[in-house]
Interface confidence: low
């Protein structure tokens, strides 16, 4: 039988009446056009909805937009377009919502051709009021908030000027010209690249990387011959042109660009690219594109300094620069990532790692599934997950994989069961243990979302026909109930729930069409009465993450420690609540070779946990460039994996000696660095 139809599925009592009393419809007085939605703050219930409609006239396009505000999680909306003087808002800039719970919002307005600068509307009270401000420049990018201080904004102008505001957009100052890319770093630092000659495009590979730590009073050039730069975790990366040819290499800094080291990664040519797939304060996943138009490359994982890299996964699917990759961080379980590889026969297969890129394996076949036509052996196959690449290829996949940090262990994704990803219509699968085991959850493609930290999963069938039914599960997708939320079906466009999966409200967005008109409509359903009581201690059970063999003493050890969680029992129908905090008990494991990556000059042969010396470096002194000094490395080949907390056990020797010699690694040496003040 299909999932959720087994007799043992307990019914949620009287749910139709409970949900009917908590279903709120709002019809927007708009022609259809486009709609964008933003949540303002965390747990505030404030939603802003911007609808825009373009009327193509003979000479120009005339646009109109409307702004709506809800303060009850979308149950009711108020038209507040008059607060922005009925101005047309540019949707390509979106709604710039301030960090944390600052309550700040910036909307960028469309202005007439001859104006001196752009116009913004600013709110610092969760969009209750807006102030109109005329800009001394035309913005090229959305306003970017400093993560540390929401009063500090930066923007690039259409003239490539870098503009900064220190008073939440009231007053603006151009701090630098000829800027290509600018990003906030930590401590209100701004990093940006500049061109000297023609333009960003013409000077690519000859750009300079600058830093200001005082919002433009003084500057320091921290890099030359720059192609691009990126920030990830505590790492600053720059791809730098080599002296002699057109190749470039990654350099990394962990001190905001004061000192740089060359990353032990392959150099890339003109047609290739580097991409930071994921980064945290411990390490980085770096994709290095293969030469030629292969559509794949190699994933490398870094050490704690971002300098020494281990090959993690070959033939990693990643189409051209800025293209598609299926790389997904499973946020519901530490150390888990899913991605796709392009095999020799050009089929695409899903791989999963449970130890932050140390080892990759296929996903285990779901027990309640048959192998499809792609499988050579009908009894042996794997689950393959549809992600960004499938969506880009217009397969019938409405959503990427979903996981939430506070819904421990839960991963929901579209997939197919065989030897490779199938172009057939996918089903929806769920894992409740972070990707180790999977179960078919729903037949056919669906939209899905997680509410109440995993206490409720909501899904809507993906269909070209109008819909009026929502499905929900209170037991992590084992059993499903269906609820008809409206008599008149709507053309469904999206599910919206507050980021963080703590809410119990879901908004279903769509439009209605009648003979003469088309209107936006939303239905917000509050599940609070389905989960009638607050969860108690008895509703939770202990779960050991990453447990694969309860008989093994080291069961659950990943990156040197294991974690035991309190998780909601599937049979408990209760509210985790908005204040729910994941309860976990970590414990340290003894070190084994698995807790170490291979050091500079060493590699791991396949299916071996020992690191052996690279043949080309055998007998050579291991000397490498670090922070602009030459270092001598004494090692037996191992370096602790970033973030690994193991103690005791195996303890390989490692020592780095400063050779007191300068080296520049094709990059800036300190004497080349210059500072200047405005």
């Amino acid at each position: 039988s299909a999932p959720g139809e087994d007799e043992e599925c307990g019914r949620v009592r009287d749910f139709v009446a409970k949900l009917a009393n908590n279903t709120h419809q709002h019809v927007f007085d708009d022609l259809r056009g486009s709609v964008s939605l933003s949540w303002v703050g965390d747990s505030t219930g404030v939603i802003l909805v911007l609808t825009t409609f373009h009327v193509p006239l003979v000479i120009m396009t005339f646009g109109q937009s409307k702004l709506y505000r809800s303060e009850d999680y979308g149950k009711n909306f108020k038209d507040i377009t008059d607060l922005i003087n009925n101005t047309f808002i540019r949707t390509e800039f979106g709604m710039a919502i301030g960090p944390e719970n600052s309550g700040k919002v910036v909307l960028t307005a469309e202005v007439s051709g001859g104006s001196r600068g752009g116009r913004i509307f600013r709110s610092s009270d969760f969009a209750k009021n807006f102030v109109q401000t005329d800009l001394p420049f035309h913005p090229l990018t959305q306003m970017m908030y400093s993560p540390q201080n929401s009063d500090y904004l930066l923007a690039l102008s259409t003239e490539n000027g870098l503009w900064v505001s220190k008073n939440f957009g009231g007053k603006w100052e151009e701090i630098h010209k000829a800027v290509c890319l600018a990003k906030w770093g930590s401590d209100n630092t701004i990093f940006f690249t500049t061109y000297a000659n023609g333009s960003c495009k013409a000077d690519l590979g000859a750009l300079e990387l600058w830093r200001t730590s005082d919002l433009g009073k003084s500057f320091k050039t921290i890099g030359v011959k720059i192609y691009s730069f990126g920030l990830g975790g505590r790492f600053l990366f720059a791809s730098v042109m080599a002296d002699k040819d057109t190749t470039r290499r990654i350099h990394v800094s962990t001190d905001q660009g004061d000192t740089w080291s060359m990353a032990q990664l392959p150099s890339v040519g003109q047609e290739q690219f580097y991409s930071i797939l994921a980064a945290n304060d411990d390490m980085v996943f770096m994709h290095v594109d293969e030469p030629g138009d292969t559509g794949f490359g190699t994933i490398f994982t870094s050490d704690d300094r971002g300098i020494v890299y281990s090959k993690s996964l070959d033939r990693h699917l990643y189409t051209t620069t800025g293209g598609e990759t299926d790389f997904t961080n499973v946020t519901s379980l530490r150390g888990v990532y899913i991605t796709s590889v392009l095999s020799e026969d050009n089929s695409i297969q899903t791989m999963i790692t449970f130890d932050q890129g140390g080892r990759w394996t296929h996903l285990r076949k779901p027990e309640n599934s048959e192998c499809d036509a792609t499988a050579k052996n009908k009894n042996e196959c794997s689950l393959h997950i549809h992600a960004s690449y499938s969506i880009s290829q217009k397969l019938n996949v409405p959503m990427a994989p979903l996981s939430e940090p506070n819904a421990v262990g839960i991963v929901i994704a579209h997939g197919s069961v065989g030897d490779a990803i199938s172009v057939m219509v996918p089903d929806v699968y769920i894992s409740d243990d972070g990707g180790y085991s999977w179960t078919k959850m729903l037949e056919g493609p669906h939209y899905y979302t997680i509410l109440d930290s995993g206490g409720i999963i909501v899904a809507i069938e993906h269909s070209s026909r109008p819909i009026n039914v929502i499905k929900f599960s209170t037991d992590e997708g084992q059993c499903w109930q269906t609820y008809t939320f409206t008599r008149d079906p709507i053309y469904f466009t999206g599910l919206a729930s507050e980021p963080g999966a703590r809410s119990m409200n879901i908004s279903i967005w769509g439009f209605t069409e009648s003979f003469l008109t088309s209107q936006w409509v939303s239905y917000t359903i509050d599940f609070k009465d389905i989960l009638e009581r607050n969860c108690e201690e008895k509703d939770y059970t202990i779960w050991l993450a990453h447990s694969t063999d309860p008989e093994d003493y080291e069961d659950g050890c990943i990156l040197g420690y294991k974690e035991q969680f309190l998780r909601l029992r599937k049979s408990s129908v209760c509210q985790n609540g908005r204040d729910y905090v994941v309860t976990k008990q970590p414990s340290i494991c003894l070190c084994s070779l698995e807790d170490f990556l291979c050091d500079f000059g060493y590699y791991r042969p396949e299916n071996d946990s020992k690191c052996v010396e690279q043949p080309e470096l055998k007998g050579h002194d291991l000397e490498f460039c670090l922070y602009g000094r030459e270092e001598h490395l004494t090692t037996n080949g191992y370096r602790k994996i970033p973030g690994d907390k193991c103690q005791g056990g195996v303890n390989p020797v490692r020592e780095v000696k400063d050779l007191k010699k300068k080296c520049t690694s094709n990059f800036l040496s300190p004497e080349k660095q210059n500072s200047k003040s405005n």
Epitope: E551, D552, Y553, G556, L590, S592, Q647, G648, V650
Partner: antibody, heavy 124, light 107 residues
Framework: QVQLVQSGAEVKKPGASVKVSCKAS????????MHWVRQAPGQGLEWMGI????????SYAQKFQGRVTMTRDTSISTAYMELSRLRSDDTAVYYC?????????????????WGQGTTVTVSS | DIQMTQSPSSLSASVGDRVTITCRAS??????LNWYQQKPGKAPKLLIY???SLQSGVPSRFSGSGSGTDFTLTISSLQPEDFATYYC?????????FGGGTKVEIK
């Protein structure tokens, strides 16, 4: 019931080696670590090292590094500790002790089941 | 290596007394501390693991507390069979180390 039975007392000359065995019964031998601890006459307890469930993993206290070898034979559920180059101050009672685990959860490597001890006397 | 210091090294008490033994680690060991009881000529017996969890089969008059560097074993009402030597042991960092022991004697 769960128990660890150790081999009998040994008298050795300085410079010789001793191999103490520890036979487990009443539980899945391959699911637990085994510690070795010794106690000199009138003294406290001294940890010597640990061997993993499958025997592939060992960790020894620095003091015994190079002199101690811990092994296990899973086919007969027996762990062994061999100490070489014996000295008179190696005279002690040697214990094997099972590493505690509880419902698949690490409990900080307490030792919940102990052997009866093997007295090793080193004397010329 | 982490040093484990037990105090007192010996104490005299009567049946029914409340007895407290302390153990101090030379650096933080979180809650990775275990307590053992040893009687003459016998192997040690695990009483408390992870600082405060009572090992099954151990009478509830034994309790443990503490985390970081300071830990306590308490016997709420001393019984005749409790006269023995008690050891603390850390398992946070290799090598595992034991305290010097506390001998509980009859007054």
């Amino acid at each position: 019931q769960v128990q660890l039975v150790q081999s009998g007392a040994e008298v050795k000359k300085p410079g010789a080696s001793v191999k103490v065995s520890c036979k487990a019964s009443g539980y899945t031998f391959t699911s637990y670590m085994m510690h070795w601890v010794r106690q000199a006459p009138g003294q406290g307890l001294e940890w010597m090292g640990i061997i993993g469930p499958s025997g592939g993993y060992t960790s020894y206290a620095q003091k015994f590094q190079g002199r101690v070898t811990m092994t296990r034979d899973t086919s007969i559920s027996t762990a062994y500790m061999e100490l070489s180059r014996l000295r008179s101050d190696d005279t002690a009672v040697y214990y094997c002790a099972r590493g505690k685990r509880s419902s698949g959860w690490y409990e900080g490597y307490g030792m919940d089941v102990w052997g009866q001890g093997t007295t090793v006397t080193v004397s010329s | 290596d982490i040093q484990m210091t037990q105090s007192p090294s010996s104490l005299s008490a009567s049946v029914g007394d409340r007895v407290t033994i302390t153990c101090r680690a030379s650096q933080s060991i979180s809650s990775y501390l275990n307590w053992y009881q040893q009687k003459p000529g016998k192997a040690p017996k695990l009483l408390i693991y992870a600082a405060s969890s009572l090992q099954s089969g151990v009478p509830s008059r034994f309790s443990g507390s503490g985390s970081g560097t300071d830990f306590t074993l308490t016997i709420s009402s001393l019984q005749p069979e409790d006269f023995a030597t008690y050891y603390c042991q850390q398992s946070d960092v290799s090598p595992i180390t034991f305290g010097g022991g506390t001998k509980v004697e009859i007054k």
